[in-house]
């Protein structure tokens, strides 16, 4: 139910945190979900548990799978799941979408690119940074703590940035890389109060019980690169991630930029195996940016399967 996606490359270190929040010193047990086999805590193992962290030193493609963590106490246990995927290293330079962390935007005033997940590792400065696989050189680029600062940002600075660092565990070193896209705000652009294109306000969507259903929340925010713009779904006023119904998930659609230059975002709500109780929920498509928030509400109604008899 409470699950988190993590990914890494074979032969690199990967450290995953239990999605159940806890404080240091809490007792956390880890299991490989498919076999219910306990993951050892001894550091001599390639894969071992260390409190809230699960460590793959280094990771192998065969490690992919779902791992269960249980935050244990004498009277109340809390269970979480880590969905881990380890990919083979690419021979070419392109970093596939599935290995990318969230995109960050920058402007002349703010051009920090944080190295994703680095806080989980035992690393020492400096970080190495690459853009589209080329090592960054020149005085415009400054690696500072866990982020890269770019001076005098230009539109050409947009691209995929990879940070590379070394994780040290008991004297052994392991390489880690992480990539995210950096976009540069177009100063000629502008932002508007969000406009939701779909769904229509108070739309009734017909669904079939037992079938899958998709709802798309689509909104436009202005022209050019947008700083802080988001679309999301809520169920009964609660974020999807907090609602705790694994059948209902949201998935980012494609960022769209129409011929007229409008910047738009999609978020698809996927409901697997529609149940009666889903018809009682209120589905809110939310679009927000610095101007404010717009909400369109959808409700589901039962669609009777077509009678094929004459």
């Amino acid at each position: 139910k409470f699950s988190k996606q993590s990914w890494g490359l074979e032969n690199e270190a990967l450290i995953v945190r239990c999605p159940r929040q806890g404080k240091p010193s809490y007792t956390v047990d880890w299991y490989y979900s498919q076999t219910n086999k306990s993951i050892p805590t001894q550091e001599r193992n390639r894969v071992f548990a260390s409190g809230q962290l699960l460590k793959f030193l280094p990771a192998a493609v065969a490690d992919s799978g779902i791992y269960t963590c249980i935050v244990r106490s004498p009277t109340f246990n809390r269970t979480g799941y880590a969905n881990v995927t380890i990919y083979k290293k690419q021979s070419d330079c392109n970093v596939p979408d599935y290995l990318m962390y969230s995109t960050v935007s920058g402007s002349e005033k703010n051009s920090k690119i944080y190295c994703p997940t680095i806080d989980l590792y035992n690393w020492t400065a400096p970080l190495e940074w690459f853009k589209n696989c080329q090592a960054l050189q020149g005085s415009r680029y400054r690696a500072h703590k866990s982020f890269l600062v770019i001076d005098n940002v230009m539109t050409e600075d947009a691209g995929d940035y990879t940070c590379k660092f070394i994780h040290n565990e008991n004297g052994a070193n392991y390489s880690v890389t992480a990539t995210r896209s950096f976009t540069v705000k177009d100063e000629q652009g502008f932002s508007l109060f969000p406009v939701i294109g779909a769904p229509a306000q108070n739309e009734i969507k017909e669904v079939e019980i037992g079938k899958n259903a998709n709802l798309t929340c689509s909104a436009c925010f202005g022209k050019g690169t947008q700083f802080l713009a988001a679309v999301l779904w809520q169920l009964n006023g609660t974020k999807i991630t907090d609602f705790g119904e694994p059948r209902i998930q949201q998935e980012e659609g494609q960022n769209q930029s129409f011929s007229n230059g409008l910047a738009c975002l999609d978020m698809v709500l996927r409901i697997a195996d529609v149940k009666e109780e889903d018809l009682l929920l209120q589905y809110d498509c939310l679009a927000l940016n610095l101007h404010g928030l717009r909400r369109h509400t959808v409700r589901l109604s039962r669609k009777n399967p077509i009678d094929h008899h004459s």
Epitope: F2, R20, Q21, G22, K23, S25, Y26, T27, V71, R72, S73, P74, T75, F76, N77, R78, T238, K239, T241, D242, F243, G244
Partner: antibody, heavy 117, light 111 residues
Framework: EVQLQESGPGLVKPSQSLSLTCTVT?????????WNWIRQFPGSKLEWMGF???????SFNPSLKSRISVTRDTSKNQFFLQLNSVTTEDTATYYC??????????WGQGTTLTVSS | DIVLTQSPASLAISLGQRATISCRAS??????????MFWYQQKPGQPPKLLIY???NLESGVPARFSGSGSGTDFTLNIHPVEEEDAAAYYC?????????FGGGTKLEIK
């Protein structure tokens, strides 16, 4: 940020039932944690009363087990305390609080309840 | 039920000095290497606030002048050096078993 807010009648007559509501914002009560009721008597003594967990399981203080129920309304992100057959001994400040299996991390500001005829 | 007995019930400490509060459990609250003892601070009109978890771990955002120690049945909260804002009631609590119980409280006054 997780926030809890208690609400209730303030005054209840002896032998009646007491009903309190805790409204949680910033976090879904079905996502994690156990959601508790704790009371503090006029002399400052604190007493844990019971909880409902994120999965809907409940646990109660045996001293209250025959009188207490804790329920929830997931659509409103609220949980409730019902205490039956109250006496003047139930006069206290009632807190709702989250519990992670170890400690009570987030607390409401408390609501004062007086039992009097 | 595990009974937690706090002492003293109240104490007055000069600014900059050390305050020591004791909590004794009627049976052990430790198991599997962890001591399920917690300390809270409560100021008038406010709910309790967590200071120390698992006997000796400082909660995030709590000043380092607060420290906890102990295992089994005997636990101690130390505040050093005491500051003006530390005037409050302090409670121990265990989560070793149900029901969870609290100590009777210690009121700290700054001289």
């Amino acid at each position: 940020e997780v926030q809890l807010q208690e609400s209730g009648p303030g005054l209840v007559k002896p032998s009646q039932s007491l009903s309190l509501t805790c409204t949680v914002t910033g976090f879904s009560i079905t996502s994690d944690y156990a959601w508790n009721w704790i009371r503090q008597f006029p002399g400052s003594k604190l007493e844990w009363m019971g909880f409902i967990s994120y999965s809907g399981d409940t646990s109660f203080n045996p001293s209250l087990k025959s009188r207490i129920s804790v329920t929830r309304d997931t659509s409103k992100n609220q949980f409730f305390l019902q205490l039956n057959s109250v006496t003047t001994e139930d006069t206290a400040t009632y807190y709702c609080a989250s519990y992670d299996g170890y400690s009570f991390d987030y607390w409401g500001q408390g609501t004062t309840l007086t039992v009097s005829s | 039920d595990i009974v937690l007995t706090q002492s003293p019930a109240s104490l007055a400490i000069s600014l900059g000095q050390r305050a020591t509060i004791s909590c004794r459990a009627s049976k052990s609250v430790s198991t599997s290497g962890s001591s399920y003892m917690f300390w809270y601070q409560q100021k008038p009109g406010q709910p309790p606030k967590l200071l120390i978890y698992l006997a000796s771990n400082l909660e995030s955002g709590v000043p380092a002048r607060f420290s906890g120690s102990g295992s089994g049945t005997d636990f101690t909260l130390n505040i050093h050096p005491v500051e003006e804002e530390d005037a409050a009631a302090y409670y121990c609590q265990h989560s070793r078993e149900i029901p969870y119980t609290f100590g009777g409280g210690t009121k700290l006054e700054i001289k």
